[in-house]
């Protein structure tokens, strides 16, 4: 039994960080393997993580780690059994994926603006809490090339536009993701889709 | 939110006994070592004892001046961590804090404290 | 056991100034890039409150004027511009080892 692609890891910078790998055939991992970390620091505590199937050859290990901070370094040891598979180390900051925006709603009853709200999904006391940006992506049901991107670089978790900007009469839908520059995270997965049907009063055009 | 609540102390003859609670929530309890630091009136901070978590074996470890008195013990379906203390002498009078660490052992949680009185 | 040795035991300083508080290990607490070192800062009635960690990191929440810096046996927090909520007795403690051993606090005071 032998690793064919390294654990590669990635953290929530909450409570979890997600490694995966491939072996080098068809493996039950939670039977067959475990994952063990632990913090470098001396007096820390050791760790297991169970891993799960993740494709035929693919593992996947949920580390939980509450209190992550930009010193912590991690020591991870993949087992099979009595056999040590791999050893290497993980420091969470250096590779962040932020957890997902939560509850994006789309506020139609302002006259003609779309208000686009969501939840930062960090708690206040999260370092991440204040750093996250936003990107929002807009896009029709019925036109494929109808697709856009929104930038969100103030703190704020909302977007307004102009509900003339978009076609009227027409079903739309729109997601959220994050990512914090200070971390130079990779982009969170984007939150669920969340769908209105676009209509304004034109305005009146004199001949 | 991390929380610490000890209880159990109180006012206990020398050679008494008395056992120290501490109720811990907001944070996965089973990860974590925990250890009792107590501060005699108007004194210093001293470390007391250490229990690790299953990962580490629930390995016990001591203060020389309360080895062989004190048994730190926990239970991690109810999340708490307890002092017992034997033989009780009036030097063992001190604020006890139940303290959580962050990392290896340095410790960003404390709960407010249960006051022993040994006396006469 | 290490023994942890802390200087001045007091400390009267003007506001806006600053405050320097030494501690002193009996041997090394530092090992692998990784220095030992930790600081706490307690107030009348209440527990400690951890204020650097790791020598030099500074805990979240903790104002920008705490710093601490150092290695081996010899380590420092300075405070700077002191404010009057400042005023507490300040406590370094190593995690070399097990005993875990505490210095013998500095009271901060303002001049």
């Known amino acids: 039994m032998k690793v064919l692609q390294e654990p590669t890891c990635v953290s929530d910078y909450m409570s979890i960080s997600t490694c995966e790998w491939k072996m080098n055939g068809p493996t039950n991992c939670s039977t067959e393997l475990r994952l063990l970390y632990q913090l470098v620091f001396l007096l820390s505590e050791a760790h297991t993580c169970i891993p799960e199937n993740n494709g035929g050859a693919g593992c996947v290990c949920h580390l939980l780690m509450d209190d992550v901070v930009s010193a912590d370094n991690y020591t991870l040891d993949l087992w099979a059994g009595q056999q040590l598979l791999w050893k290497g180390s993980f420091k969470p900051s250096e590779h962040v994926k932020p957890r997902a925006p939560g509850n994006l709603t789309v506020h139609t009853n302002v006259s003609d603006t779309l208000l686009l709200t969501w939840s930062n999904p960090y708690p206040p006391d999260n370092y991440l809490y204040n750093h996250l940006t936003y990107a929002v992506n807009i896009w029709s049901e019925n036109d494929p090339a109808d697709f856009r991107i929104y930038n969100v670089t103030y703190l704020e978790p909302s977007l307004r536009i102009a509900a003339s900007t978009l076609k009227s009469g027409i079903s739309y839908r729109a997601r959220v993701r994050a990512w914090a520059q200070c971390y130079n995270t990779t982009w969170s997965e984007w939150s669920p889709s969340t769908k209105w049907h676009n209509s304004y009063r034109e305005p009146f055009e004199q001949h | 939110e991390v929380q610490l609540i000890e209880s159990g102390g109180g006012l206990v003859q020398p050679k008494g006994s008395l056992k120290l609670s501490c109720a811990a929530s907001?944070?996965?309890?089973?990860?974590?070592?925990m250890d009792w630091v107590r501060q005699a009136p108007g004194k210093g901070l001293e470390w007391v004892a250490r229990i690790r978590s299953k990962g580490s074996n629930f390995e016990t470890n001591y203060a020389d001046s309360v080895k062989d008195r004190f048994t730190i013990s926990r239970d991690d379906s109810q999340s708490m961590v307890y002092l017992q203390m034997i033989n009780l002498k009036t030097e063992d009078t001190a604020m006890y804090y139940c303290?959580?660490?962050?990392?290896?052992?340095?410790?960003?949680?404390w709960g407010q404290g249960t006051l022993v009185s040994v006396s006469a | 056991d290490i023994v942890v040795t802390q200087s001045p035991a007091s400390l009267a300083v003007s506001l806006g100034q600053r405050a320097t508080i030494s501690c002193r290990a009996s041997k090394s607490v530092s090992t692998s890039g990784y220095s030992y070192m930790h600081w706490y800062q307690q107030k009348p009635g209440q527990p400690p409150k951890l204020l650097i960690y790791l020598a030099s990191n500074l805990e979240s929440g903790v104002p920008a004027r705490f710093s601490g810096s150092g290695s081996g046996t010899d380590f420092t927090l300075n405070i700077h511009p002191v404010e009057e909520e400042d005023v507490a007795i300040y406590y370094c403690q190593h995690s070399r080892e097990l005993p875990l051993t505490f210095g013998a606090g500095t009271k901060l005071e303002l001049k």
């Open positions: 907001g944070f996965t309890f089973n990860m974590y070592a």
């Open positions: 303290v959580r660490h962050r990392g290896g052992a340095w410790f960003a949680y």
